[in-house]
């Protein structure tokens, strides 16, 4: 490849040469593909709004929970159980949370009057002991409520547990009350204020529009734009029972989806609300089901700091805001159209696949002979020949051989390793169809040469002589006219080739060989046809005519220009041409690979 390129190389354009097949079947397949692809591309463009530039939503959320609950608590005072009624308002059952979340307490366990001192642990598998050996001074178990002193003391009756330094009395390990103490939280309502922004489109809006009726309650079908939600309804939407979840607590997601079309002609930007249970309702008891946390109310009694520990069970509501805002963008449209253009090539890929499949050797040898209805597909072989040009890699070992008594050409693509080329089987390739237009370029003398007196008899004589093999002809010769090669031992086998595979008349005895290959008049015409002002001296004339004769034979017997380049001339033809156009001195060089 040249190292530098000229200016003319820059200003050029390459394009593919195509084969147009006039076929009703393939035409229908092509248009079927094109219509389907075009329909899909248009449908996707409109339905997914792929002509828009989309931007994710940026949002802020603010919530207000409303509702009052009456709680009936069972407490033990001086060994007597009492039922205490208390009213819980928003400040009692909600806790400040960060992010887009709010929490509603639904159940609780109280441990009152705790102060820091030494006391026995609450009895559990890990805290029960039979001697001091079961406790370890300074030991802090992750499940424990304090630091062990190393003593095993009586907890109650004959139960002994490890003594700890902690907030005493130790919180009891007990189940959450059933039913939940704040079961009526089901009727609480929450107002969700959600402001959203699409900075790239310079657009801001909110879920509460000025004309909204503030006394509404959200309903999926009857009031889907109302931002006030009843907690019980949220759970009903997800198929959960509020009373069941309220016992242990849980996590509920409130999803606000904004799918905004910000184009002036189709403007729409309203939220869609949906709900999703986010905690694992199937959790094993050992893996802490529900949602709970502890908090303490601290106070002083007789100058001693005390606290009331409350284990709070409740529902955390996570508000998840997501969505996109889209607006028409010419670049997005162009990019989309560009990305879909390649789909239109699917028709070509599919049709090429059919042509390649139906023209394969497998179909020709196994399917077409047995399947009569498949026979119309044979036409694909014709399409394939027109569409594809097969070329063989021009390796140094590539050679083509043509025997006059065989209809095909043999391709030999291997090293001979001392074997005569005559004996190498090679691969059969079809002989290219003759292009008779080339004959019209030959001089008129070839078409209607008057018979030269005496010559036909000589040819006849030659034919008679050629059939029996002479004593001088090599063993591989089948026509009796071949001569041994003069090349060195290593290259000799390349010239050990006859014009025939089986014994018979030599091709050099044919009328056409004389007229096409040996006619000085024709060869001179061909040389001048290439170079009209060619001046030839005697020695160079013979050399040029000899090589032109070789070429004429190769083109005549091999047809294709590519095959002719790698054609090996039979020994009989080679020596007949050399006899007609001899070299004044020195040896003949023999075949040389053109690449």
């Amino acid at each position: 490849m040249p190292a530098c390129c000229s200016c003319s190389d820059v200003f050029q354009y390459e394009t593919n040469k195509v084969t147009r097949i006039q076929s009703m079947n393939y035409g229908t397949i092509k248009w079927f593909f094109h219509v389907i692809i075009f329909s899909y591309v248009c449908f996707a463009l409109v339905s997914d709004k792929l002509y828009q530039r989309k931007e994710p939503v940026i949002s802020s959320v603010h919530t207000k929970v409303k509702g009052i609950a009456e709680v009936k608590e069972e407490i033990v005072e001086n060994g007597v159980k009492k039922l205490v009624h208390s009213v819980f308002d928003t400040a009692d059952y909600t806790f400040p949370l960060q992010g887009n979340s709010f929490f509603v307490m639904t159940n609780f366990l109280k441990t009152e009057g705790q102060e820091q001192r030494l006391c026995p642990e609450y009895p559990t598998r890990r805290t029960l002991c039979s001697s001091d050996r079961g406790c370890k001074k300074g030991w802090m178990d992750p499940q424990s409520k304090g630091i062990q002193t190393g003593r095993c003391v009586v907890y109650e009756g004959n139960q002994k547990t490890c003594e700890v330094s902690a907030w005493c009395p130790i919180e009891a390990v007990e189940e959450a009350p059933r039913p939940a103490l704040l079961n009526s939280a089901e009727n609480f309502t929450v107002l969700i204020k959600n402001n959203i922004d699409f900075p790239g489109h310079n657009y801001t809006t909110r879920n509460i529009l000025p004309g909204l009726n503030i006394t509404c309650t959200f309903h999926k079908t009857q009031n889907p734009q109302c931002p006030i939600f009843r907690l019980g309804d949220i759970f009903r939407e997800t198929g959960d029972n509020f009373s069941d979840v309220a016992i242990q607590g849980g996590i509920m997601g409130i999803e606000i989806y904004w799918d905004c079309n910000l184009d002036r002609w189709f403007h729409h930007c309203r939220p869609k609300y949906s709900f999703r249970r986010l905690d694992d309702k199937t959790t094993n008891v050992s893996l802490y089901p529900g949602y709970n946390f502890r908090y303490a109310k601290y106070y002083k009694e007789n100058n001693v700091e005390k606290r009331t520990l409350i284990k709070v069970f409740g529902i955390r509501f996570d508000i998840l805001v997501f969505g996109t805002g889209g607006k028409f963008d010419i670049i997005q449209l162009v990019v989309y159209i560009g990305s879909t253009l390649s789909y239109f090539g699917l028709a070509a890929v599919f049709i090429d696949f059919l042509i390649d499949t139906y023209s394969s050797n497998c179909c020709r040898s196994h399917i077409y002979p047995w399947c009569k209805c498949c026979q119309p597909c044979v036409v694909n072989e014709y399409y394939y020949r027109k569409k594809c040009e097969s070329i063989v890699e021009p390796k140094p070992t590539l050679k083509y051989v043509s025997f006059v008594d065989e209809s095909h050409i043999r391709m030999v693509n291997q090293q001979l390793l001392g074997r005569s080329l005559q004996d190498v089987k090679g691969q059969e390739v079809p002989r290219p169809a003759m292009d008779f237009t080339d004959l019209s370029r030959l001089p008129l003398a070839l078409h209607d040469t008057p018979p030269i007196p005496g010559q036909p008899e000589e040819i006849q004589l030659l034919r008679k002589e050629a059939t029996p093999r002479s004593r001088d002809s090599p063993v591989w010769c089948q026509c009796g006219s071949c001569l041994p090669s003069q090349l060195p031992e290593s290259h000799r086998c390349l010239e050990e080739l006859c014009c025939r595979k089986k014994p018979g008349a030599c091709i050099t005895t044919s009328e056409l060989f004389r007229k096409l290959v040996l006619s000085r008049h024709v060869l001179q015409f061909l040389l001048l046809y290439q170079e009209p002002l060619l001046a030839l001296d005697v020695d160079s004339t013979n050399s040029r005519l000899r090589h032109c004769a070789y070429r004429c034979y190769a083109t005549w017997r091999f047809g294709s220009q590519d095959m002719a380049d790698f054609a090996i001339l039979p020994s009989c033809c080679r020596w007949r041409i050399r006899k007609e156009f001899p070299k004044s001195e020195g040896q003949y060089s023999g075949f040389k690979s053109p690449y």
């Epitope: 598998r125 890990r126 029960l128 002991c129 039979s130 050996r133 079961g134 406790c135 370890k136 030991w139 178990d141 992750p142 499940q143 050992s286």
Partner: nanobody
């Protein structure tokens, strides 16, 4: 849930040896601390030996140096090799299992019977001449 079956009990002369074996059912055997306890007639259940799921062992004061506990997680068994047996070793020997899935049992707690959730039916060992 783990089922425990003790075997290997019997009558043996003082100074003799005996090998008890505890076979456990359940795929999660390797997550359990295993212990041997014994109860002589009219006495409290007493700790003999224990091995945690990660292989640390603990022995009762009266059997230290004479008894050896080991575990074979492939076969789900916990053998107790008892050598130099004395008449006071006569008792019903129980195999016990403590779940360590959610946290290891501290070494100083391995001898506490309260740590063990699952118990076998027991096998009798009698040491007499």
């Amino acid at each position: 849930e783990v089922q425990l079956v003790e075997s290997g009990g019997g009558v043996v002369q003082p100074g003799g040896s005996l090998r008890l074996s505890c076979a456990a059912s359940g795929r999660t055997f390797r997550h359990y601390a295993m212990g041997w306890f014994r109860q002589a007639p009219g006495k409290e259940r007493e700790f003999v030996a224990a091995i945690s799921s990660y292989g640390s062992t603990d022995y009762g004061d009266s059997v230290k140096g004479r008894f050896t506990i080991s575990r074979d997680d492939a076969k789900n068994t916990v053998p107790l090799q008892m050598n130099s047996l004395k008449p006071e070793d006569t008792a019903v020997y129980y195999c016990a299992a403590a779940d360590e899935t959610l946290g290891a049992v501290p070494n100083f707690r391995l001898h506490e019977k309260y740590e063990y959730e699952y118990w076998g039916q027991g096998t009798l060992v009698k040491v007499s001449s």
